[in-house]
């Protein structure tokens, strides 16, 4: 099939001791090969500080996956989710302030 770019959605949820879990979800993409990683100041976080979900079919002939990490509250601006898929790429910020969701569809 033809390439379908991912929808990327960044969310954050508060956890204890001033840390936040940030999750980057990529969905509705094809083919299944994708790079999804958290960056701090543009530098990829080490593998042992990130948790990845499997790349799974989402039932529409496309795929979905996610990556999560924990960051210190107040440092959200330093972090972005980096995505590469079928020659396209993008960086996606952690939502700031009261906005806890960020959606972006790649074209």
């Amino acid at each position: 099939g033809s390439t379908v770019p991912p929808m990327v959605n960044v969310t954050c949820s508060e956890v204890s001791e001033g840390n936040i879990t940030v999750t980057c979800r990529a969905s509705s993409f094809y083919p299944r090969n994708i790079t999804l990683t958290w960056r701090q100041d543009g530098v990829s976080l080490s593998h042992n500080t990130q948790q990845w979900g499997d790349v799974l079919p989402d039932g529409n002939g496309t795929y979905q996956t996610w990556v999560a990490t924990r960051i210190r509250q107040g440092e959200e601006q330093r972090f972005t989710c980096y995505m590469e898929h079928s020659g396209n790429h993008g960086t996606h910020p952690v939502p700031s302030g009261n906005s806890h969701h960020h959606h972006h569809h790649h074209h």
Partner: antibody
Amino acid sequence: EVQLVQSGAEVKKPGASVKVSCKASGYAFTSNNIYWVRQAPGQGLEWIGYIDPYIGRIIYNQQFKDRVTITADTSTSTAYLELSSLRSEDTAVYYCSRSGERSNFDYWGQGTLVTVSS
Amino acid sequence: EIVLTQSPATLSLSPGERATLSCSASSSISSNYLHWYQQKPGQSPRLLIYRTSNLASGVPARFSGSGSGTDYTLTISSLEPEDFAVYYCQQGGSLPLTFGQGTKVEIK
């Protein structure tokens, strides 16, 4: 081959502004941050700030944020550093650098000497 | 701000000798955020070691890095003539990003 090519040396008077450019090639410009660092004569390295060209996010070293503006033009793969209200202490070589996969500064421009003198 | 203090300021050695450069941080840093750069006169800095102990592309195996917490070390096992330069450590864990003041390795 990744290359960062900076604009030429500048001589400025105190109180003036200077704008230094950094043209990137050999990679997808919007996939990496561009950092700016300066080095006064005979001194060490000092981080000024960076820009994520994809989303336009800029993070400044608070020490510089009142006088520095970092921008990027994705159509020409060029980043810019503008420093205003120049003083003699701003005399330095200004470097642009690209963020790497595993380190903050993996490729560097050749540097631009800015001399502030009356 | 995390202050990085490098010692010694100058190291005078002969080719073939071992060089040990230290970098001490004012606060603890994750080893993932400590990097080393080499700068020769009139040149831009060059990434040497990333994440404490990993050699950057094209860097000879005589260079090595180690450390954790607040104390980090760059070692050159046997100095070659092209190794005489200034070496900087840098931390990327906290803003502002900071560099050490440098250690100059000069020919004795």
